[in-house]
């Protein structure tokens, strides 16, 4: 990473308005199929990708207002094995439904300390945060 | 989103050192199987998730030094259909290999304009950026 400043002053610089997130308004991201209720282990013939997958999954919210992005979603597999392409319901033990992980760049809001130890606004601290993105139907590992 | 400042001054506030990304050093994320060479349409019995998947994919780098994260990776499907769980090589026309998309929060470095139009450091502009995360084996849509 190149050196980008990570600290922002707390008071009116350059103006309160500019200190808002200066973007085209974007709604908080909600996966199309955010479903916290029980979902059966089956592959649908319609609906979003995560319900049509033969390794179906649901999304769970991870919210931290001191982090950017504030809302992240973690995938949770609904089946241990893959669902048969033929029936869409019976599981096929020849395939495993595995979580795909990703280390996402996030930023945490932290207090900034001035030269004399006094607080000077806050810092944005870059971190890698592990999220599960999806469930993938894979062939089981064959140990050598 | 709650209101977080998005602008940072350009000169020594609170100090040059503090203005560096104040984190534990993290190497740029490289998926384990970043492979830009031709890969056959088959599901491996070992290796990383994207090569063992019956909807295998490779990663392509997307680099922008004025963006955080600077490096993003896009998945590219290696097969139009899913690979048979039985053979790991023949395609099964009953399943499609589809890209899973995600609108990721990214930040762009933009000049900040002061009250008199002069530049006051830069702003971090939040945007949603579409990335393909993986390829998923799905049952084809059945149109009603």
């Amino acid at each position: 990473y190149s050196h980008w400043p990570s600290c922002c002053p707390s008071k009116g610089y350059p103006s309160e308005e500019l200190l808002r997130w200066s973007t085209v308004p974007v709604p908080p991201l909600k996966p199309a199929s955010l479903d916290f209720h029980s979902v059966s282990c089956r592959a649908s013939e319609d609906g979003p990708l995560n319900s049509r997958a033969i390794s179906p999954w649901r999304y769970e919210l991870d919210r931290d207002l001191n982090r950017l992005p504030q809302d992240l979603y973690h995938a949770r597999c609904l089946c241990p094995h893959c669902v048969s392409l033929q029936t869409g319901s019976h599981m096929d033990p020849r395939g495993n439904s595995e979580l795909l992980y990703h280390n996402q760049t996030v930023f945490y809001r932290r207090p900034c300390h001035g030269k004399k130890g006094n607080h000077k606004g806050y810092c944005l601290e870059r971190r890698l945060y592990r999220v599960s993105l999806a469930c993938v139907c894979v062939r089981p590992r064959v140990m050598g | 989103y709650s209101h977080w400042p998005s602008c940072c001054p350009s000169k020594g506030y609170p100090s040059e050192e503090l203005l560096r990304w104040s984190t534990v050093p993290v190497p740029p994320l490289k998926p384990a199987s970043l492979d830009f060479h031709s890969v056959s349409c088959r599901a491996s019995e070992d290796g990383p998730l994207n090569s063992r998947a019956i909807s295998p994919w490779r990663y392509e780098l997307d680099r922008d030094l004025n963006r955080l994260p600077q490096d993003l990776y896009h998945a590219r499907c290696l097969c139009p259909h899913c690979v048979s769980l039985q053979t790991g090589s023949h395609m099964d026309p009953r399943g499609n290999s589809e890209l899973l998309y995600h609108n990721q929060t990214v930040f762009y470095r933009r000049p900040c304009h002061g009250k008199k139009g002069n530049h006051k450091g830069y702003c971090l502009e939040r945007r949603l950026y579409r990335v393909s995360l993986a390829c998923v084996c799905v049952r084809p849509r059945v149109m009603g």
Partner: antibody, heavy 125, light 108 residues
């Protein structure tokens, strides 16, 4: 100033549904970052968080009680309602509603900064 | 779920004593919050974000800690400090608020 007040039945029979209302003033639950939660305390025991609702209508529940709880808000009435189905004598407790929404120079606080006085609910036949 | 364990559960102290209450989390957390509760009353916030005093809280109260171990310290006990103290954390995934089991401070 900020005030919160819980209301609801003092006595509920087992298997019935308990409905509690939190009426608040001095803040708006439509303000970004604002949230309101329910906490209970059985007699002589510790505090137990039950449910939370955010300004944007995102809801969280204690996993062990998720199937029995529903939290809703009516921003125009300044009210948050908690319903608990299939109550049992072990649900006997003082139920509190509490606000969360403090943004300091160092960030957002996940502490409940204002609490109602609590309402004692007894579950008994 | 992250578990919080407070120790001790009961503590007898005298006016003027220095008292320390600890709160251990089952896995690492970013911040801890502390409350004081008196009989028949709602809890009152004492410490925000590990070490920041809530409004109106006397400076004899302080908080510290990181990772899995956090402490609340009362430098010199006063008669009005005899109460039950609770630690609390927020976990972002799944979003949950967790309280410790409480520490009851009694007069010796």
């Amino acid at each position: 100033q900020v005030t919160l007040k819980e209301s609801g039945p003092t006595l509920v029979k087992p298997t019935q549904t308990l409905t509690l209302t939190c009426t608040f003033s001095g803040f708006s639950l439509s303000t970004s970052g604002m949230g309101l939660g329910w906490i209970r305390q059985p007699p002589g025991k510790a505090l137990e968080w039950l449910a939370h609702i955010w300004w944007d209508d995102v809801k969280h529940y204690k996993p062990a009680l998720k199937s029995r709880l529903t939290i809703t808000k009516d921003t125009s009435k300044n009210q948050v309602v908690l319903t608990m189905t299939n109550v049992d004598p072990v649900d006997t407790a003082t139920y509190y509603c509490a606000r969360m929404g403090q943004l300091h120079y160092y960030g957002y606080d996940y502490a409940m900064d204002y609490w109602g006085q609590g309402t004692l609910v007894t579950v008994s036949s | 779920d992250i578990q919080l364990t407070q120790s001790p559960s009961f503590l007898s102290a005298s006016v003027g004593d220095r008292v320390t209450i600890t709160c251990s989390a089952s896995s690492s957390v970013s911040y801890m919050y502390w409350y004081q509760q008196k009989p028949g009353k709602a809890p009152k916030p004492l410490i925000y974000r590990t070490s920041n005093l809530a409004s109106g809280v006397p400076s004899r109260f302080s908080g510290s800690g990181s990772g899995t171990e956090y402490t609340l310290t009362i430098s010199s006990m006063q008669p009005e400090d005899f109460a039950t103290y609770y630690c609390q954390l927020y976990h972002s995934y799944p979003p949950t608020w967790t309280f410790g089991q409480g520490t009851k401070l009694e007069i010796k």
